[in-house]
Interface confidence: medium
């Protein structure tokens, strides 16, 4: 049987001759040279050579454990004469023994990290990591210990983990923002003779809101004319803040003072300035000077720094209003007046009022802009602004009159103002309803009683509040003797019905029916319209065959109540193509 153990070989051998590994030996070997040892496997014949007589193995080259820590080889012992194995082939291992030949190497040459300013001592910054290629399972060659070479007293490093932490209280970004820290990693547990590597960590303090805004001056003064429209910028103020980014953002507000409702302050997002603007129309005559208290504050406050004091500052802003000569001002931007359409001439509709806003309070006179009232329907009392009619009105002609009134300072005619007047003419029931169209219809000679021959509709120029509601009836003079009746449908329509059985066109070829239409409004208006009814000869289907000659040439045609139309160029047989009138045999 084979007689050997596992072989060990020190890496990085520096001797001049081959490095002895060990000896293969079979108990069949009697030392007479009859056995031959053969080596095969990893590096056999190249890295490793064997003395075929003695079984001694040597390494021909310097080996690096970090390159290959284990070699697997096979050993054979054969009879030199016959070539037959005297032992079964056997596998064995050569294990390369570690020496501390590698220094720790950091995963990065340069690390960058950030940490908030004013962070508590021991706040995590970043973790650095160094690796050592030596054998971690044997000795301390790969046991790395971290230490800080540069960066104290601001930062510290945990020796075993490489975690860098803050080491100094109240590190202030506004004082110093950048730090360069050098960290060393040393193997052999940091002992003497250990190998080491270093890395640089660039640490930036990030901003926190630890500084309030501050006005560089306590008082500002601006001027603005009283004519400045709302939104006009008057001046700019700026508070400074040592912080950066959103921590340096400033909101301005008016917190006190008599001009709180007259002025606004808005923040210019680009410059972080406060722009004082006019909020409401100013009036020199009412107030000449305003004093405001303006506050600059940080919108993003960090509660843990509130102990440092309020994160705001205030300044006084004095605004002087300059006088401007102003035109008269009307009491309203526009006036809406109403007047009934039956108003008499010289009826007062309402009044306008304007006043010179200047301290002088110049008297004003009123006039109507005649370009807006060419027909001179309205007039105005130049002294008191009363509007009155100078002509009769008609809502049905014009519902709204839009005129302009001018107020002029008597002592300074260049100063004038205009105001629109919208005058609505209110409806009065002053129009009677009328037929919607000219009604001419026909009845067959053999028609039966109560037969509908025409539907009537009415129109009315008035506009009653809840809509038209017409009623229809025969005129009193015709009601008793008529051959036809009116049926009021109570829906703004009425029907003409036959009252008797049969009509004779030779006795009476045309009937004229006076129909009274009433609008039931207040006061009630009514009119009488005439419906012409022609008596015609019809076939047994109710189709007209012949009529009085006048009917044939009437341009509006005849109607059965179903919208049929008679064309004067048609033949008698196709005069009506419309709805057939019921026929009673």
């Amino acid at each position: 049987s084979w007689m050997w153990n596992q072989f060990f070989l020190l890496e990085e051998y520096t001797g001049s001759d081959y490095q002895y590994v060990g000896k293969l030996h079979s108990d069949q070997d009697r030392g007479d040279g009859s056995l031959k040892y053969i080596l095969s496997g990893d590096g056999a014949g190249d890295l490793f050579i064997i003395n075929e007589n003695t079984g001694d193995i040597q390494a021909t080259k310097r080996l690096d454990r970090e390159e290959k820590p284990v070699y697997i080889l096979r050993a054979q012992a054969v009879n030199r004469r016959t070539g037959r194995p005297v032992e079964p082939e056997s596998e064995f291992i050569i294990k390369i023994h570690d020496i501390n030949d590698n220094e720790p190497i950091f995963t990065k040459d340069v690390y960058t990290a950030t940490v908030p300013e004013m962070a508590d001592v021991g706040t995590f910054v970043v973790q650095v990591t160094a690796t050592d290629a030596d054998d971690p399972t044997y000795g301390n060659s790969a046991k790395v210990v971290y230490s800080i070479l540069q960066g104290q007293p601001y930062f510290s490093v945990e020796s075993e983990t490489g975690i860098i932490k803050t080491a100094l209280l109240n590190m202030d970004r506004e004082n110093r923002e950048q730090y360069q820290v050098v960290i060393q990693a040393k193997d052999m547990g940091g002992q003497m003779g250990g190998l080491s590597g270093t890395t640089t960590v660039n640490i930036t303090l990030t901003d926190v809101n630890d500084n309030p805004p501050r006005f560089p001056q306590s008082t500002y003064q601006f001027k603005t004319p009283e004519s400045s429209p709302p939104g006009t910028p008057i001046g700019r103020i700026k508070a400074s803040d040592a912080d950066v980014g959103e921590n340096a953002e400033i909101e301005y507000s008016i917190t006190d003072g008599e001009g709180h409702e007259m002025f606004d302050v808005i923040t210019d997002q680009e410059t972080q300035e406060g722009i004082i603007t006019v909020k409401k129309l100013l009036d020199f005559e009412k107030k000449k000077v305003y004093t405001l208290k303006v506050e600059a504050s940080n919108p993003h406050v960090e509660p843990r720094f509130l102990y440092l004091g309020p994160f705001k500052d205030s300044a006084t802003v004095r605004i002087v209003v300059d006088d401007v000569d102003e035109p008269p001002v009307f009491s309203k931007l526009a006036y809406i007046l109403q007047i009934r359409e039956d108003a008499r001439i010289n009826t007062t509709i309402g009044s306008v009022a304007a006043q010179d806003p200047d301290a002088a309070r110049n008297p004003v006179k009123y006039s109507v802009d005649r370009h807006t009232d060419m027909d001179r329907i309205f007039n105005i009392d130049s002294g008191n602004g009363s509007i009155f009619t100078s002509k009769l009105l008609d809502r049905e002609t014009l519902l709204w009159h839009n005129i302009t009134v001018i107020a002029t300072e008597i002592n300074n005619p260049k100063q004038s103002s205009r105001v629109p007047l919208y005058i609505k003419v209110l409806d009065v029931n002053d129009n009677a309803p009328e037929f919607a169209e000219f009604y001419e219809t026909f009845v067959c000679e053999k028609a039966k009683a109560d037969q509908l021959i025409q539907t009537l509709r009415a129109v009315d120029k008035d506009d009653p509040y809840s809509g038209h509601q017409f009623s229809f009836s025969l005129a009193p003079e015709a009601a008793s003797s008529s051959n036809f009746t009116i049926q009021d449908n109570k829906d703004n329509t009425a029907g003409i019905l036959t009252r008797k059985n049969g009509y004779n066109r030779h006795e009476m070829s045309t009937y004229l029916l006076p129909v009274v239409i009433s609008d039931n409004d207040y006061p009630v208006q009514s009119s009488t319209g005439t419906v012409t009814v022609r008596v015609c000869a019809c076939d047994h289907h109710g189709n007209m065959q012949s009529c009085h000659a006048e009917a044939l040439i009437h341009p509006t045609g005849l109607s059965t109540g179903a919208g049929s139309e008679f064309r004067h160029d048609s033949g008698l047989n196709d005069i009506f193509e419309a709805q057939k009138i019921e026929w009673h045999e």
Partner: antibody
């Protein structure tokens, strides 16, 4: 006979919407202006709005408390009046009636009413 | 807006009594004044239109009068079915109602 029947009432949350209907029968619906009226529990009558007939251009008019939130419409082919109520408030809680507008601006026929409750 | 003020807001009466309810408009309303009767849980019912016109089917014991701004509803002889709330309504400019008068049994 003339009949008006309201429907569509119910419970709705503030800010919600509801559509009421008023079905008409027994008269020529298209010729009449129709009004909506409401009555809060234990309170008096309050006009809501109205719509004129086709002949008067379907003009609508609304009471100030509902203007901009309520819309009245009608479908003459279905003889139906509608009240679309949006952005409802608790003070809109009431029985809602539809009523036919007759001569001299009076309301001669009314529906039986439908209750609308606006509550969270 | 035109305001309508009804008085009294309630009254107690017996069957057979003559009852008068008044309604005042804040401005003239051209006789566009209507009277309605409402019973609990029911829709209002038109009694009088345009100040003095009796609606079809309404008993003749109901009558209305007045013009301009002052109007009156009279029930000549109160009947058991007349105990209800009565409202006046103006139709001259938009529509507004009085606050109602409740007629109760004495």
């Amino acid at each position: 006979q003339v009949q008006l029947v309201e429907s569509g009432g119910g419970l709705v949350k503030p800010g919600g919407s509801l559509r009421l209907s008023c079905a008409a029968s027994g008269f020529t619906f298209s010729s009449y202006a129709i009004s909506w009226v409401r009555q809060a529990p234990g309170k008096g009558l309050e006009w809501v709005g109205f719509i004129k007939s086709n002949a008067d251009g379907y003009t609508t008019n609304y009471a100030a408390p509902v203007k901009g939130r309520f819309t009245i419409s009608r479908d003459d082919s279905k003889n139906t009046l509608y009240l679309q109520m949006n952005s409802l408030k608790t003070e809109d809680t009431a029985v809602y009636y539809c009523a036919r507008i007759r001569y001299f601006r009076n309301w001669d026929y009314w529906g039986q009413g439908t209750l609308v409750t606006v509550s969270s | 807006d035109i305001q309508m003020t009804q008085s009294p807001s309630s009254l107690s009466a017996s069957v057979g009594d003559r009852v008068t309810i008044t309604c005042r408009a804040s401005q003239t309303i051209n006789s566009y004044l209507n009277w309605y009767q409402q019973k609990p849980g029911k829709a209002p019912k038109l009694l009088i239109y345009r100040a003095s016109n009796l609606q079809s089917g309404v008993p003749s014991r109901f009558s209305g009068s007045g013009s301009g701004t002052d109007f009156t509803l009279t029930i000549s002889s109160l009947q058991p079915e007349d105990f209800a709330t009565y409202y006046c309504q103006q139709g001259d400019s938009s529509w507004t109602f009085g606050q109602g008068t409740k007629v109760e049994i004495k």
